[in-house]
């Protein structure tokens, strides 16, 4: 049997059963999540669940830019340092940059400081690029 790889929406890229869209425009975290959802297919701000997934995403983004942080789907909705993925994925893989926590910073971004492989927390109303993900 021939197994066809699922296709992603135009402009999205495929990796290990998921489609990713890197949006190089400015949104706060909640507006970014709304835009992701608007694409249907269960799309959300991206969960990053392994180093392999993180590395693939980082390599893709580095082809566009290397200086701007990017919203991902990790947030702290209760503001109690109880982080969770907006798509419901298990919060097992962690890649915090170390000096991330504290203040009114309850949304996570991929940090450009380590080639997008580590995360930092930031104020959710900050407007920046974002990454969406869905399973086709």
């Amino acid at each position: 049997d021939i197994i066809m790889r699922p296709s992603c929406a135009p402009g999205w890229f495929y990796h290990k059963s998921n489609c990713y869209g890197y949006f190089r425009k400015l949104r706060n975290w909640s507006d970014a999540e709304l835009e992701c959802q608007s694409y249907g297919n269960g799309a959300h701000l991206a969960s990053i669940l392994s180093l392999k997934e993180a590395s693939t995403i980082a390599e893709y983004i580095s082809g566009y830019q290397r200086s701007q942080p990017i919203w991902i789907g990790l947030h702290d909705p209760q503001k109690r340092q109880q982080w969770q993925w907006i798509d419901g994925a298990m919060y097992l893989y962690r890649s915090w940059s170390g000096k991330s926590m504290g203040g009114n910073k309850h949304c996570a971004e991929m940090s450009s400081n380590n080639n997008f492989l580590t995360w930092s927390s930031n104020e959710c109303n900050k407007r920046q690029h974002f990454l969406c993900k869905y399973r086709p």
Epitope: G11, G21, Y22, F23, R24, K25, L26, R27, D31, L34, E35, Q37, S38, S67, Q68, K126, R127, Q128
Partner: antibody, heavy 119, light 111 residues
Framework: EVQLLESGGGLVQPGGSLRLSCAAS????????MSWVRQAPGKGLEWVSA????????YYADSVKGRFTISRDNSKNTLYLQMNSLRTEDTAVYYC????????????WGQGTMVTVSS | FMLTQPHSVSESPGKTVTISCTGS????????VQWFQQRPGSAPTTVIY?????PSGVPDRFSGSIDSSSNSASLTISGLKTEDEADYYC???????????FGGGTKVTVL
């Protein structure tokens, strides 16, 4: 052919209201964020408002916030701008513009509709 | 956040003109810059998007660049033609307040 066609402009008194429409054709309207941009006579371009493809998120310039409302009807492929409490400084040609999904870059513009606010 | 352009530039046919667009704060390289051409009585059209990309149909005489050291973007038109006579606007994004920001426009005159 990808096209945007504005309508609804005209002469209105200060304090009055007007609703502009922008009819889109030739593309999947709901997949694109849209903006209104205006240009006062002899002046430069000024961004007014934007709306996401789904209509779930809206954005406004400070100069129109609380007076203008942007909306869209994806079933009719139409973008709207409801303008209330109009002022003389709102006199301008109003353009609708399509934005690229991944970058917000304007790629298609309508031909514009003239709004004149005068007593 | 503001984008400042020269009010006007003029040059002879066949020559090269460069229009600058300087950001008032932050780093202009942080967000994409677009350039629009507007001929009298017409709607704007895009000549450069994403800093240096040309839409199909725009001649390669038009080019865009970013200079982080001067916090400015530039539009260069080489081999100037009479049909290039128009107003040119730069546009970018404000990550703190406004959603979209336009420069004040530059009138290009072909002598």
């Amino acid at each position: 052919e990808v096209q945007l066609l504005e309508s609804g402009g005209g002469l209105v008194q200060p304090g009055g209201s007007l609703r502009l429409s922008c009819a889109a054709s030739g593309f999947t309207f709901s997949s694109y964020a849209m903006s209104w941009v205006r240009q006062a006579p002899g002046k430069g371009l000024e961004w007014v408002s934007a709306i996401s493809g789904s209509g779930g998120s809206t954005y406004y310039a400070d100069s129109v916030k609380g007076r203008f409302t942007i909306s869209r009807d994806n079933s009719k492929n139409t973008l709207y701008l409801q303008m209330n409490s109009l002022r003389t400084e709102d006199t301008a040609v109003y353009y609708c513009a399509r934005q690229q999904p991944f970058t917000d870059a304007f790629d298609i513009w309508g031909q514009g509709t003239m709004v004149t606010v005068s007593s | 956040f503001m984008l400042t352009q020269p009010h006007s530039v003029s040059e002879s046919p066949g020559k090269t003109v460069t229009i600058s667009c300087t950001g008032s704060s932050g780093n202009i390289a942080n967000n994409y810059v677009q350039w629009f051409q507007q001929r009298p009585g017409s709607a704007p059209t895009t000549v450069i998007y994403e800093d240096n990309q040309r839409p199909s149909g725009v001649p390669d005489r038009f080019s865009g660049s970013i200079d982080s050291s001067s916090n400015s973007a530039s539009l260069t038109i080489s081999g100037l033609k009479t049909e290039d006579e128009a107003d040119y606007y730069c546009q970018s994004y404000d990550s703190s307040n406004l959603y979209v920001v336009f420069g004040g426009g530059t009138k290009v005159t072909v002598l």
